[in-house]
């Protein structure tokens, strides 16, 4: 907190320029007009003033704005937004894209600050929905944007935004994740044909049911292996040695090589080894000739 | 991470010369204004002079008159030169730009002392 003293003769700022980086904090306190400020927030930007002296800025900033910044000024804030804390932005309305996109540029190369996840927070709830323009601005800064958030969140993304997202968008994004973006996904890409269809829905399938794998392997899609890898357990177990070798196509050979990793080692225990043998790749596991096979699972539900 | 080396500084006699320099690791010059910076021992750190992209030059009233700051954007290199150097001139000299400031991220900065 800077003292309250008198500006000097001649020190009051006629406007906001690099002269002000000479004046000592209290100085720019008491010689400072915060509606000038205020109204010249775009210049600060381009003056090296030193973190100690952007605090007495904010803290005028403050005093004129107790209630939150007016989106005018928000926009103009520059590095000053990194003076800002979370409880500051929870003050603050804003509703312009380029508004957030001037503030993101500010922390642009740094890992997502609590001041921009408040900031990004405040803006969507804002706006209802995460819009395709605001995650495709949201994305470009932050790739890793969409996974952070929570099933709950992703729900109010409408199914025309995810146009808007890329296979590395989804690269840290857990099953729970996938499954509410996957059918979302589905009904956004449903007017492609097949093979453009599939090159768009691929990174979304960690969230496919048993259904759609089935329906994917008619199709000769050649699904590689790292997208297989990360296909729901629960959804490869019911698929059949054919409809594998299917969707694979050649990367079937792949299957080798992760034999004893999830999911394809639950899978092949699922499997007869006639079955398996068919496919010529030496996998073993598979339930042995003439044992029957009880679907328990069946049963249960039956019952 | 812009990285700025800041060297040039040395032990000189009252009203003698040294120009110090100051190098970035990336292209920050040429659309930012450049600062010079001062901290004595036991004292706030105070600017002295600036530069603006465009070239204009502001100086503190201690220093001016005695100092001038210049940058050569091409190689990211701005200077500052510093004539008629006094004892209460000595202090660790640094540069930076606005980022670098507000984020409060600075050089080793280059030791002047002014001493007969």
């Known amino acids: 907190e800077v003292e309250k003293t008198a500006c000097p003769s001649g020190k009051k700022a006629p406007e906001i320029d690099e002269s002000l980086i000479f004046y000592k904090k209290w100085e720019l306190e008491a010689c400072v007009d915060a509606a000038l400020l205020a109204t010249q927030m775009d210049r600060v930007n381009a003056i090296p003033f030193t973190y100690e002296q952007l605090d007495v800025l904010k803290h005028k900033l403050d005093e004129l704005y107790p209630q939150g910044y007016p989106e005018s000024v928000i926009q103009h804030l520059g590095y000053l937004f990194l003076k800002m804390s979370p409880e500051d932005i929870r003050k603050w309305n804003v509703t312009s894209l380029e508004t957030l996109k001037a503030l993101l540029e500010v922390n642009k190369g740094h890992e997502m600050s609590p001041q921009v996840a408040t900031l990004i927070d405040r803006f969507v709830k804002g706006r209802g929905q995460l819009d395709k323009d605001t995650l495709d601005t949201l994305t470009a800064f932050y790739p890793g944007y969409l996974c952070s958030l929570s099933p709950e969140e992703l729900s109010s993304v409408p199914p025309s935004s995810i146009w808007a997202v890329r296979p590395q968008d989804l690269d840290t994004c857990d099953p729970r994740q996938l499954d509410v973006l996957y059918p979302k996904a589905r009904l956004a890409f449903q007017n492609m044909n097949g093979s453009e269809y599939f090159v768009k829905i691929q990174s979304f399938l960690g969230g496919a049911p048993t259904e759609d794998l089935k329906a994917l392997s008619q199709q000769n899609v050649s699904m590689d292996l790292a997208t297989f890898m990360k296909l729901r357990t629960d959804a490869v177990l019911p698929l059949t040695v054919a409809e594998v070798q299917k969707l694979l196509g050649p990367h079937v050979e792949g299957l080798k090589a992760e034999e004893r990793h999830r999911p394809v080692r639950d899978w092949i225990l699922r499997q007869r080894q006639d079955d398996l043998d068919t496919l010529g790749l030496g996998l073993q596991g598979g339930i042995p000739n003439g044992y029957l096979v009880l679907d328990l699972s069946m049963q249960e539900a039956l019952s | 991470q812009v990285q700025l080396v800041e060297s040039g500084g040395g032990l000189v006699q009252p009203g003698g010369s040294l120009r110090l320099s100051c190098a970035a690791s990336?292209?920050?010059?040429?659309?930012?204004?450049v600062a010079w910076y001062r901290q004595a021992p036991g004292k706030e750190r105070e600017a002295v002079a600036v530069?603006?992209?465009?070239?204009?030059?502001k100086y503190a009233d201690s220093v001016k008159g005695r100092f001038t700051i210049s940058r050569y954007n091409a190689k990211n290199i701005a200077y500052l030169q510093m004539n008629s150097l006094k004892p209460e001139d000595t202090a660790v000299y640094y540069c930076?730009?606005?980022?670098?400031?507000?984020?409060?991220?600075w050089g080793q900065g280059t030791q002047v002392t002014v001493s007969s």
């Open positions: 530069i603006t992209r465009d070239g204009d030059t």
């Open positions: 930076n730009t606005a980022r670098g400031a507000a984020v409060d991220s």
């Open positions: 990336g292209s920050i010059f040429s659309g930012n204004a």
